[in-house]
C-alpha cells in the first residue's frame, strides 16, 4: 500500500537508507511531500517486522518500485491505495 501524506510536522527522517527492501518485507510505504516545515520529500517504509526505515528518495530501487506501483495503480485498483491525509 502506497500512502501520500500531507502533514504540518517538521522532517521525520534523520537517517536515510538506499538499500533494497524486498516487497515481502514491506507493510506499507508512506510518502511525505516536500513543504510544510520540511524542505525535502521523505519516504518512510513500514516493515512487517514493525520497524520503520526512511529511504533516500533518490535511491534507484525505490524510484523503480514507485514507478511499478504507479503503473499498477493506474490499471488495477484498489491496490495500491494513494491516501491524502490533511490534519
Amino acid at each position: 500500500v502506497l500512502e501520500v501524506y500531507y502533514t504540518s510536522l517538521r522532517c521525520r527522517c534523520v537517517q536515510e537508507s538506499s538499500v533494497f527492501i524486498p516487497r515481502r518485507f514491506i507493510d506499507r510505504i508512506q510518502i511525505l511531500p516536500r513543504g510544510n516545515g520540511c524542505p525535502r520529500k521523505e519516504i518512510i517504509v513500514w516493515k512487517k517486522n514493525k520497524s520503520i526505515v526512511c529511504v533516500d528518495p533518490q535511491a534507484e530501487w525505490i524510484q523503480r518500485m514507485m514507478e511499478v506501483l504507479r503503473k499498477r495503480s493506474s490499471s488495477t485498483l484498489p491496490v495500491p491505495v494513494f491516501k491524502r491525509k490533511i490534519p
Epitope: 538506499s18 538499500v19 516487497r23 520497524s51 534507484e60 530501487w61 523503480r64
Partner: antibody, heavy 120, light 107 residues
C-alpha cells in the same frame, strides 16, 4: 558470535522421511526470517523455503512445497525442515540461513550444513 | 520463477587480474541481487547485497553493480584467497533463485 548449526541429516531410503534441525545462538532468533538452502553434490545452490518470525508467512520452492515443510520454535531457537517422500535427487547438503530483514534484507549468516543422502 | 543466468561458468585468471562475472535475470529484479562466495566444503559467504553494497568485513576489491536485469560482480585485483565459486542470487521475489555459479581458478 552468531552460530547456526544444522543436524538431522543422514542416509535414508527413497520414499522415506527426515527432519532437519537448525539450532541458532548469538542472535535474537525470534526476530528473523529464516531459510533453508540446499546444494546437491557438485551442483549449485537451490533455495528450499523461508519462514518469518511469527510463522505466518511461509514460502517454498514450487517443486518442493508438496513434500517439504518448514517450521520453527522460537522458544527453542530452532528451525526445522520436515522432508517426506524423499527421492534420490534430494541428496544434498542442506544449509539454514538467517534472512536479515532489518538492514541487509538478504541471507547474511549460514550454518555449515548437514548432509542428506537418499539411496537404497 | 525468475531465472538467473550467470556467466562464465568457469574462468582462469592470474593474481592481480581484474575479474568480472555477469548475471542476467529473466525479468526485472530491481536491485534485489546478492553475490556469494563459496569455498569447497564450506557454506556460502555474503559479499554483496542490494546489487552494489559490500557486506561488513568484505575487502574493497569486491564490488557489484547493476539494476533491472543486468548485474556485474568484479574483483579488481585477484588474490590467491579469492579462489572459490561465486553465485549471484535474486531476492526480489520468491522463489528466491541463484545463478549457476562461476568457478574461479588461478592460472
Amino acid at each position: 558470535e552468531v552460530q547456526l548449526v544444522e543436524s538431522g541429516g543422514g542416509l535414508v531410503q527413497p520414499g522415506g522421511s527426515l527432519r532437519l534441525s537448525c539450532a541458532a545462538s548469538g542472535i535474537d532468533f525470534s526476530r528473523y526470517w529464516m531459510s533453508w538452502v540446499r546444494q546437491a553434490p557438485g551442483k549449485g545452490l537451490e533455495w528450499v523455503a523461508e519462514i518469518n518470525p511469527e510463522s505466518n508467512f511461509i514460502n517454498y520452492a514450487p517443486s518442493l512445497k508438496d513434500r517439504f515443510t518448514i517450521s520453527r520454535d522460537n522458544a527453542k531457537n530452532s528451525l526445522y525442515l520436515q522432508m517426506n517422500s524423499l527421492r534420490a535427487e534430494d541428496t544434498a547438503v542442506y544449509y539454514c540461513a538467517r534472512q536479515d530483514d532489518y538492514s541487509v534484507y538478504a541471507m547474511d549468516y549460514w550454518g555449515q550444513g548437514t548432509t542428506v543422502t537418499v539411496s537404497s | 520463477d525468475i531465472q538467473m543466468t550467470q556467466s562464465p561458468s568457469s574462468l582462469s585468471a592470474s593474481v592481480g587480474d581484474r575479474v568480472t562475472i555477469t548475471c542476467k535475470a529473466s525479468q526485472d529484479v530491481n536491485t534485489g541481487v546478492t553475490w556469494f562466495q563459496q569455498k569447497p566444503g564450506k557454506a556460502p559467504k555474503l559479499l554483496i547485497y542490494s546489487a552494489s553494497y559490500r557486506y561488513t568485513g568484505v575487502p574493497s576489491r569486491f564490488s557489484g553493480s547493476g539494476s533491472g536485469t543486468d548485474f556485474t560482480f568484479t574483483i579488481s585485483s585477484l588474490q590467491p584467497e579469492d579462489i572459490a565459486t561465486y553465485y549471484c542470487q535474486q531476492y526480489y521475489s520468491t522463489p528466491l533463485t541463484f545463478g549457476g555459479g562461476t568457478k574461479l581458478e588461478i592460472k
